[in-house]
């Protein structure tokens, strides 16, 4: 039988607001990934910040809702948006435990469906709602 | 087909500690939950906790935390509860199940001086 | 933590005629996701428990269909149409929503 869906949950430091609420969290001591326990949906996300080819995670938690991409088994993340040149976010939503603790590629910042010139620009940190 | 083996039975002092396994076939043990439930003697069914093999994240009932440790081996897909300073009380059955849908067939601890 | 009240804790039954058991919960059962996370188990003498129905009316593989479940909120019922022997056991409902996870106190099903 399922159980209430688990996802890893991470805050960046500087990050603003925070899907805390979104779940319950898991006392899982120091060493292993903190873990949230979902609240309101079946779905977990991840969101990292790929600039210059490296990719550094920003937020990892639960969804406030299943909606398209929580049936997915993996995170595939795809491109958001731009918070600064040169950094694309990328985001994945997916319904599986644990499944928001890593992705399975990444897509090249340029490949098609990422916001051009002309897309949401926004200052380290204050992304992270437009990509949700 | 799915099948949970677990190790036999245990008879242990006060205050000592016992370590029981749980041997999983038949499915990927890294994709579900292993929970444990302990069955008192001529008593109901309480659950104790649940771990993760993936990644080792527990999640307990509050009533066995420092008296249960649950640990996995996924090289040999097998999961472990170790219980500690055992009083008679913890005399009982102890099952492993996959997420609670495969039970294994019990671990009787008895708890006697 | 959420009780589990299972009604009747005996339950003795002819072959062939139906049987129903009752669960009440402390705290209602539907979760924010919308799932409800209740569970019946039989455990024969001498065996494991043995999952019969999850999410209150799901029948897991290879029960047979004269185990159905429903309910919602804080009452729950497990019927069975026509009781055979091989029904003989404890039945215990079980709440997987609120931490801790708890048991019903179970209901021995026995024949007449």
């Known amino acids: 039988p399922p159980n209430r869906r688990t996802c890893v949950f991470f805050e960046a430091p500087g990050v603003r607001g925070s899907t805390k609420t979104l779940g319950e969290l898991l006392d899982t001591g120091t060493e292993l990934p903190r873990a949230i326990r979902c609240l309101y949906s079946r779905c977990c996300f991840g969101i990292w910040n790929l600039t210059q080819d490296r990719a550094q995670v920003e937020m990892q938690g639960c969804r406030d809702s299943d909606e398209p991409g929580c049936e997915s088994l993996h995170c595939d993340p795809s491109p958001r948006a731009h918070p600064s040149p040169g950094s694309t976010l990328f985001t994945c939503s997916c319904g599986t435990d644990f499944c928001n603790a890593n992705y399975s590629h990444l897509p090249p910042p340029g490949s098609p469906g990422t916001p051009g010139s002309q897309g949401p620009q926004a200052a380290p940190g204050e992304s992270i709602w437009m990509a949700l | 087909q799915v099948q949970l083996v677990q190790s036999g039975a245990e008879v242990v002092k006060p205050g000592a500690s016992v370590k029981m396994s749980c041997k999983a076939s038949?499915?990927?043990?890294?994709?579900?939950?292993v929970s444990w439930v302990k069955q008192s003697p001529g008593q109901g069914l309480e659950w104790i906790g649940e771990i993760y093999p993936k990644n080792g994240v527990s999640n307990f009932n509050e009533k066995f935390k420092g008296k249960a440790t649950l640990t996995v081996d996924k090289s040999t897909s097998t999961a472990y509860m170790e219980l500690r300073r055992l009083r008679s009380d913890d005399t009982a059955v102890f099952y492993c199940?996959?997420?609670?849908?495969?039970w294994g067939q019990g671990v009787l601890v008895t708890v006697s001086s | 933590d959420v009780v589990m009240t299972q009604s009747p804790l005996s339950l003795p039954v002819t072959l062939g005629q139906p049987a129903s058991i009752s669960c009440r919960s402390s705290?209602?059962?539907?979760?924010?996701?919308?799932?409800?996370?209740l569970e019946w188990y039989l455990q024969r003498p001498g065996q494991s428990p043995r999952l019969l129905i999850y999410g209150v009316s799901n029948r897991f593989s290879g029960v047979p269909d004269r185990f159905i479940g429903s309910g919602s909120g804080t009452d729950f019922t497990l019927k069975i149409s026509r009781v055979e022997a091989e029904d003989v056991g404890v039945y215990y409902c079980?709440?997987?929503?609120?931490?801790?996870?708890?048991f019903g106190a179970g209901t021995k099903l026995e024949i007449k």
């Open positions: 705290q209602s059962l539907e979760y924010g996701d919308g799932y409800t996370y």
């Open positions: 038949g499915y990927t043990f890294t994709d579900y939950w």
């Open positions: 199940t996959r997420q609670r849908d495969y």
């Open positions: 079980f709440q997987a929503t609120h931490d801790p996870n708890t």
